[in-house]
Interface confidence: medium
């Protein structure tokens, strides 16, 4: 009679993490008696998937049961695979005895797991930075398998050039990282930008996921100052006002100086927002010029989103009748506080 | 053929021990695993304790763990089940059975039973 | 623990007819659910093992089906020496739980 043979058909088997892998096995005979194992890799080290004769496998069914005693066929179905169960797995049939012992092992089937990438989460600098600098975007997607993936940058739908990927580990692993980082040279019409890191793999069928960073949250775009000086209808009073513009984020506080003392400080609330998303705002000053002797500084300092105060200052000349010094270019917003100087 | 024979059951009061006893013949004892299953009167089975062919896996019923051991002696193909602190709702006919191979298999051939009961 | 139940608890067939046994369990028991017959005064003997699988010796007028939560136990043309109580018992995990067992009769 032939010696028994241990048959492994499948060389390899690629299952979806989350389904189940059948690994096949069938003996070519009875004899000898003794009880068959399936093992993960070989050597001292091998782990234990399955032991017909005992132990408690909550994962592990046996696919043929159907004559039992004189089954020959050992295939097994192990559930909820994931990327951890990646490996060659053996089955190996023992001899009978105290203890049994190993007969005759199976060639292997290598069992890979094609895992799903997932959401690539991308990250920004941690600090905002201004229009004309270049900033770096990172994107990380995890748990994949096989490593082969593929990541694109966009730029309101431009795809970008500018960056750097790289998949982790360099060598056999059960599971894939990729992580990139983009550069991205700011603008000041980039409040309502947006980059997207998109990731492509195997298990996704072609419908790729993408990963999000609004340049809102990374951008600032430092306001232009203009003081400008309007005559009224009342003698001897001039409106001066300051026009913050272009400006985001909206955090903004703004400091009438007179002759380099402080005279009021408001925040910027009721702002009118551009289309590129900047806002605007402008604030004002009522000055009675007949309270002064002589010539008025008036300042115009604004702090915008904790930045270092940038300045406008207007010369009032209390010497000359009030008259047109400048022009009055209206914003759509001309709410704010009045202040009369006396 | 295949034989399974239980004994040391009897009357015994609340509190005391016992200990049962499971001869196997006409079979290779230590390729199995055994079991206990009990039958209170006119009740159905229960499934009290579970041991490997090589005691490397033992289960127990919630209802008998800490109190009942089983074990067993592959040299005398003998099956035991140490029953201490017993209590009123342990009386039943208390049946060995053998289980082919896996923990997945079934009990493919059991003994006539012993009675145990539990009373003052 | 998966609980068993089996319905109906009772069963009255006339000879010859078919008689069927339900077992649902709490949770998947994948295949491993099995069918023991017990007799007055006997000791349990298994008929159907891994749900559907039929032990040597037993009449083939017994049948089993299901998977996951849901068994049946068939019996195509019951006989006089059918009269029993029959339990469903799961081996998917510890503990191994039994069915309250259901009573056949002849009608």
């Known amino acids: 009679e032939e010696e028994l043979q241990v048959i492994q058909p499948d060389k390899s088997v690629s299952v979806a993490a989350g389904e189940s892998a059948i690994l096949h096995c069938t003996v070519t005979s009875l004899i000898p008696v003794g009880p068959i194992q399936w093992f993960r890799g070989a050597g001292p080290a091998r782990e234990l998937i399955y032991n017909q004769k005992e132990g408690h496998f909550p994962r592990v069914t046996t696919v043929s049961e159907s004559t039992k005693r004189e089954n020959m066929d050992f295939s097994i179905s192990i559930s909820n695979i994931t990327p951890a169960d990646a490996g060659t797995y053996y089955c190996v049939k023992f001899r009978k005895g105290s203890p049994d012992t190993e007969f005759k092992s199976g060639a292997g089937t290598e069992l890979s797991v094609r895992g799903k990438p997932s959401a690539p989460v991308v990250s920004g600098p941690a600090a905002r930075a201004t229009p004309q600098h270049t900033v770096s975007f990172t994107c990380e997607s995890h748990g994949f398998s096989p490593r082969d993936i593929t990541l694109k940058w966009f730029k309101n739908g431009n795809e970008l050039s500018d960056f750097q990927t790289n998949v982790d580990p360099v060598g056999e692993s059960v599971s894939y990282s990729i992580h990139s980082t983009a550069k991205v040279v700011l603008t000041r019409e980039d409040v309502h930008s947006q980059v997207i890191c998109e990731v492509a793999h195997v298990t996704l069928q072609g419908d790729p996921l993408r990963g999000t960073a609004n340049l809102s949250e990374t951008i600032r775009v430092p306001p232009t100052l203009e003081v400008t000086q309007q005559p009224v209808r009342a003698e001897n009073q001039v409106n001066v006002t300051c026009q913050v513009r272009k400006f985001y984020p909206q955090r903004l506080q703004l400091t009438w100086l007179e002759n380099g003392n402080v005279s009021r400080t408001e925040t910027a609330s009721t702002v009118t927002e551009n289309k590129d998303g900047t806002y605007n705002w402008m604030s004002w000053l009522l000055v009675n010029v007949s309270a002064h002797r002589d010539d008025v500084k008036l300042t115009c300092q604004v702090e915008h989103d904790g930045q270092p105060a940038v300045s406008k200052s207007h010369d009032l000349k209390v010497s000359a009748h009030p008259k047109e010094q400048g022009s009055n270019t209206a914003a759509e917003n001309t709410g704010s506080n009045e202040r009369n100087i006396y | 053929q295949v034989q399974l024979v239980e004994s040391g059951g009897g009357v015994v009061q609340p509190g005391r021990s016992l200990r049962l006893s499971c001869a196997a013949s006409?079979?290779?004892?230590?390729?199995?695993?055994m079991i206990w299953v009990r039958q209170a009167p006119g009740k159905g089975l229960e499934w009290v304790a579970s041991?490997?062919?090589?005691?490397?896996?033992?289960y127990y019923a919630d209802s008998v763990k800490g109190r009942f051991t089983i074990s067993r002696d592959n040299s005398k193909n003998r099956l035991y089940l140490q029953m201490n602190s017993l209590r009123a709702e342990d009386t039943a006919v208390y049946y060995c059975?053998?289980?082919?191979?896996?923990?997945?298999?079934?009990?493919?051939?059991w003994g006539q039973g012993t009675m145990v009961t539990v009373s003052s | 623990d998966t609980v068993l139940t089996q319905s109906p608890d009772s069963l009255a067939v006339s000879l010859g007819q078919r008689a069927t046994i339900n077992c649902g369990a709490s949770k998947s028991v994948r295949t491993y659910m099995h069918w023991y017959q017990q007799k007055p005064g006997q000791q349990p003997k298994l008929l159907i093992y891994?749900?559907?699988n039929l032990e040597a010796g037993v009449p083939s007028r017994f049948s089993g089906s299901g998977s996951g939560t849901d068994f049946t136990l068939t019996i195509s043309s019951l006989q006089a020496e059918d009269v029993a109580v029959y339990y469903c018992q799961q081996s998917n995990e510890p503990p191994y739980t039994f069915g309250q067992g259901t009573k056949v009769e002849i009608k």
């Open positions: 006409g079979f290779t004892f230590s390729d199995y695993g």
């Open positions: 041991i490997s062919s090589s005691s490397s896996y033992i």
């Open positions: 891994s749900a559907s």
């Open positions: 059975a053998r289980r082919y191979y896996g923990f997945n298999y079934p009990f493919d051939y």
